[in-house]
Amino acid sequence: APFDDDDKIVGGYNCEENSVPYQVSLNSGYHFCGGSLINEQWVVSAGHCYKSRIQVRLGEHNIEVLEGNEQFINAAKIIRHPQYDRKTLNNDIMLIKLSSRAVINARVSTISLPTAPPATGTKCLISGWGNTASSGADYPDELQCLDAPVLSQAKCEASYPGKITSNMFCVGFLEGGKDSCQGDSGGPVVCNGQLQGVVSWGDGCAQKNKPGVYTKVYNYVKWIKNTIAANS
């Protein structure tokens, strides 16, 4: 079914300005992925967002306008998970070390790593500058937000038979209409103040019985901590 032109993310809403202070934009001459600031010098994104040169843009709301709160910092190190599989998208996670520390303030701050796996039914916030159209392409300038629940692993696997690994989980609505989309990859799924997911993949966007699939950050907390320690 067609959705209104003002549907955001797909089916979300305009985030309040700088209300998602951990959200970053990955830029290579254009915005191509999102990410999450997890400490002053490290960002989590998706493995499939890898590029050899990335500028990390923090404090963004409207990515087409300099609003005065931005910090643009080049990536010093880009570390894709060693077991990332581009065919199955298993281990779709990546760490970016910033070439200088971010200045933490009200508009740029970090998000906590998870202390437990995501629980079914938990309401989460997904954000990004991705496509807002479920068919075709319409890219917003301002950050979009979507509140969506964690789906059970059984429903997730039923939606994508044989494709869901233990490192993935689904968030969204089986009825369709609300979802992350192209341009949201690498961005955050935050549940109860913890970074539970990284936007990864899906069959289209906002399609019925095809919810968004996200990297389960909980499974990578040890890798994240070890990698940061080894590269500090």
């Epitope: 890898y50 040169r53 068919s135 075709g136 392409a137 890219y139 990864s200 993949w201």
Partner: antibody
Framework: QVQLQESGPGLVKPSETLSLTCTVS????????WHWIRQPAGKGLEWIGR???????YYNPSLKSRVTMSVDTSKNQFSLKLSSVTAADTAVYYC????????????????????WGQGTTVTVSS | DIQMTQSPSSLSASVGDRVTITCQAS??????LNWYQQKPGKAPKLLIY???NLETGVPSRFSGSGSGTDFTFTISSLQPEDIATYYC????????FGGGTKVEIK
């Protein structure tokens, strides 16, 4: 089977604006991204830009200041305008459809071109 | 901008020969590389996408390989109809083409 046809003036005066249109037949313009590419005689290919049916555009950074692309979904057409042309803009101009192998990932990326028009020659001369 | 360096710029080979063209990117582009064939007076035709995937309907004598910065395009057994100019194209960051390789029959 989707077909593309470029049209527009074959001769443009220096400093003026080159305007071309690509008409898509045999399929909807709405489900893909669309490109313009050019090729000076005897030389290689140069990508000009990409447009979505929403009007969202990406331009070659070296041409960005002079390029405007637009789309008219009702006519199944998309267009190119290149301002302040010089003799260096003389070329065969192609329109093409993006591979749009969206794949399943949710990043913004480019894919390439799987359907091309036959090209139209534009000469910049007074 | 990402530069694509293609070599050789031209080559001459006999029918049945194995032909290899290389393309080098100025920075890591993962597998985001395509190969096109362009015959005189015609538009380019996509042969291979994402470095190694054969486009539908393209003969299996064409193949591609590589990742990162170094890529190879191969025609396993050159046919008369393969006379054309071949271009690599990176799609990792915007789009740029290599300079082309003109393939002729000896």
């Amino acid at each position: 089977q989707v077909q593309l046809q470029e049209s527009g003036p074959g001769l443009v005066k220096p400093s003026e604006t080159l305007s071309l249109t690509c008409t898509v037949s045999g399929g909807s313009i709405s489900s893909h991204y669309w490109h313009w590419i050019r090729q000076p005689a005897g030389k290689g290919l140069e990508w000009i830009g990409r447009i979505a049916t929403s009007g969202s555009t990406y331009y070659n950074p070296s041409l960005k200041s002079r390029v405007t692309m637009s789309v008219d979904t009702s006519k199944n057409q998309f267009s190119l305008k290149l301002s302040s042309v010089t003799a260096a803009d003389t070329a065969v101009y192609y329109c093409a459809r993006d591979l749009t192998n969206y794949g399943i990932t949710k990043s913004i990326r480019f894919y390439g071109m799987d359907v091309w028009g036959q090209g139209t020659t534009v000469t910049v001369s007074s | 901008d990402i530069q694509m360096t293609q070599s050789p710029s031209s080559l001459s080979a006999s029918v049945g020969d194995r032909v290899t063209i290389t393309c080098q990117a100025s920075q890591d582009i993962s597998n985001y590389l395509n190969w096109y064939q362009q015959k005189p007076g015609k538009a380019p035709k996509l042969l291979i996408y994402d470095a190694s995937n054969l486009e539908t309907g393209v003969p299996s004598r064409f193949s591609g390989s590589g990742s990162g910065t170094d890529f190879t395009f191969t025609i396993s057994s050159l046919q008369p109809e393969d006379i054309a100019t071949y271009y690599c194209q990176q799609v990792d960051n915007f789009i740029t083409f290599g300079g082309g390789t003109k393939v002729e029959i000896k």
